[in-house]
């Protein structure tokens, strides 16, 4: 079976479909949740929806084999299997591994450490979001892009305030948080 990966945002409507056309005049078509839990089946010209957590929020298009699921949640994370029984008795199957992610929340920037060192301002900032597996990127007047939840930098004496932005992202969303410092080493605003 061919395996396709799909990542979507929770609460969205999703279409599970295959990239090729269905076998001509197939006999039966079934969508499964995991290996063997039936969601819907097409047989003898009609669709039968099974008692499952999807009942009432799925629809099958027998022409294309596409399965529409409304309002997906993280609990819908699974491998979905479409099995088609052809007229000659041979089976074909396609698998879609669906990953449902919540949109990332706005990050909170915390000052872990702030001290004056020889007229310079040493800063250690952390970008915090609750228990998510995300990517971090810091932007600002930095020698290089930092892809870490913690930013450590030293500010030379400066006239204007300096701002640092932490961007948290997963594959379906991203949010920014910004923290500014005014000279010499004063937290101005976030």
């Amino acid at each position: 079976g061919r395996l396709v990966h799909m990542t979507v945002v929770s609460g969205s409507n999703v279409t599970l479909n295959i990239s090729e056309s269905l076998p001509e005049n197939y006999k039966q078509l079934t969508w499964f949740y995991t290996f063997d839990q039936k969601i819907v089946e097409w047989d003898s010209g009609k669709s039968k929806y099974f008692e499952s957590k999807f009942k009432g929020r799925v629809r099958l298009d027998p022409q294309s084999g596409a399965l529409y699921i409304s309002k997906v949640q993280k609990e819908d994370n699974s491998t979905y299997v479409m099995r088609v029984l052809k007229k000659d008795g041979y089976e074909q199957e396609w698998k879609i591994k669906l990953q449902v992610l919540d949109p990332v929340p706005k990050p909170v920037i915390k000052i872990e450490k702030r001290e004056d060192v020889d007229d310079n301002c040493y800063l250690k900032l952390s970008c915090v979001i609750p228990g998510e597996s995300v990517n971090y990127t810091w932007y600002g007047e930095l020698p290089k892009e930092i892809q870490n939840s913690v930013l450590e930098t030293t500010l030379k004496p400066h006239k204007h305030s300096r701002c640092y932005t932490c961007q948290v992202s997963n594959s379906v969303s991203s949010k920014n948080g910004t923290f500014c410092f005014s000279p010499p080493c004063t937290a101005a605003r976030s």
Epitope: G1, K27, E41, D43, G89, Y90, E91, E93
Partner: antibody, heavy 117, light 107 residues
Framework: QVQLVQSGAEVKKPGASVKVSCKAS????????IHWVRQAPGQGLEWMGI????????RYAQKFQGRISMTWDTSTSTVFMELSSLKSEDTAVYYC??????????WGRGTPVTVSS | DIQMTQSPSSVSASVGDRVTITCRAS??????LAWYQQKPGKAPNLLIF???SLQSGVPSRFSGSGSGTDFTLTISSLQPEDFGTYYC?????????FGQGTKVEIN
């Protein structure tokens, strides 16, 4: 010509385990299923479980849960079925069958397993 | 589990006779039914899948019908080589379950 070739007859003592192999020869499928079915002397057919060596999915009949295990060696296209804590009632011919999910278009010749003290 | 009940348990008929075996499922299985023939000392052989589709290489005297809970296997003109035990099997759900078998003997 696709064939399911099974290992030979086994004689076991009660409480022991037996491991039966089933090799899919001549097949070129990337995805196939192997079911295990047994038949006690003079009795009907009893489905034991299914495995898909391609993705590792396995499902056992409740009756055998806890003492059956299906494993595979994809490099040799061989599936194994191990049944433990054998009892005299496990005396049967054990068939592997496939290659479809829904029904069995191909069967091995069967492996007789005798459980006797 | 879905129970499969076959009848009759045995049938004795002459060459050329029409033989009918029925199979009843304890719940709706749509057309997820297969029929197998087994000869003594041999592995079963698939005859019919999806209730009515003839497996490749199986003689056309074998036919299957039915859907839901009631199914029939018909041998339109019994041949000497058709002796053996016939099993129905539901393929709708796990565990896959078989009927208890119908033994067909030639008079």
């Amino acid at each position: 010509q696709v064939q399911l070739v099974q290992s030979g007859a086994e004689v076991k003592k009660p409480g022991a385990s037996v491991k039966v192999s089933c090799k899919a020869s001549g097949h070129t499928f990337t995805n196939y299923y192997i079911h295990w079915v047994r038949q006690a002397p003079g009795q009907g057919l009893e489905w034991m479980g299914i495995t898909n060596p391609n993705d590792g999915n396995t499902r056992y009949a409740q009756k055998f849960q806890g003492r059956i295990s299906m494993t595979w060696d994809t490099s040799t296209s061989t599936v194994f079925m191990e049944l433990s804590s054998l009892k005299s009632e496990d005396t049967a011919v054990y068939y592997c069958a496939g290659l479809r999910y829904w029904f069995f278009d191909l069967w091995g010749r069967g492996t007789p397993v005798t459980v006797s003290s | 589990d879905i129970q499969m009940t076959q009848s009759p348990s045995s049938v004795s008929a002459s060459v050329g006779d029409r033989v009918t075996i029925t199979c009843r499922a304890s719940q709706d299985i749509s057309s997820w039914l297969a029929w197998y023939q087994q000869k003594p000392g041999k592995a079963p052989n698939l005859l019919i899948f999806a209730a009515s589709s003839l497996q490749s290489g199986v003689p056309s005297r074998f036919s299957g019908s039915g859907s839901g809970t009631d199914f029939t296997l018909t041998i339109s003109s019994l041949q000497p080589e058709d002796f053996g035990t016939y099993y129905c099997q539901q393929t709708d759900n796990f565990p896959r379950t078989f009927g208890q078998g119908t033994k067909v003997e030639i008079n």
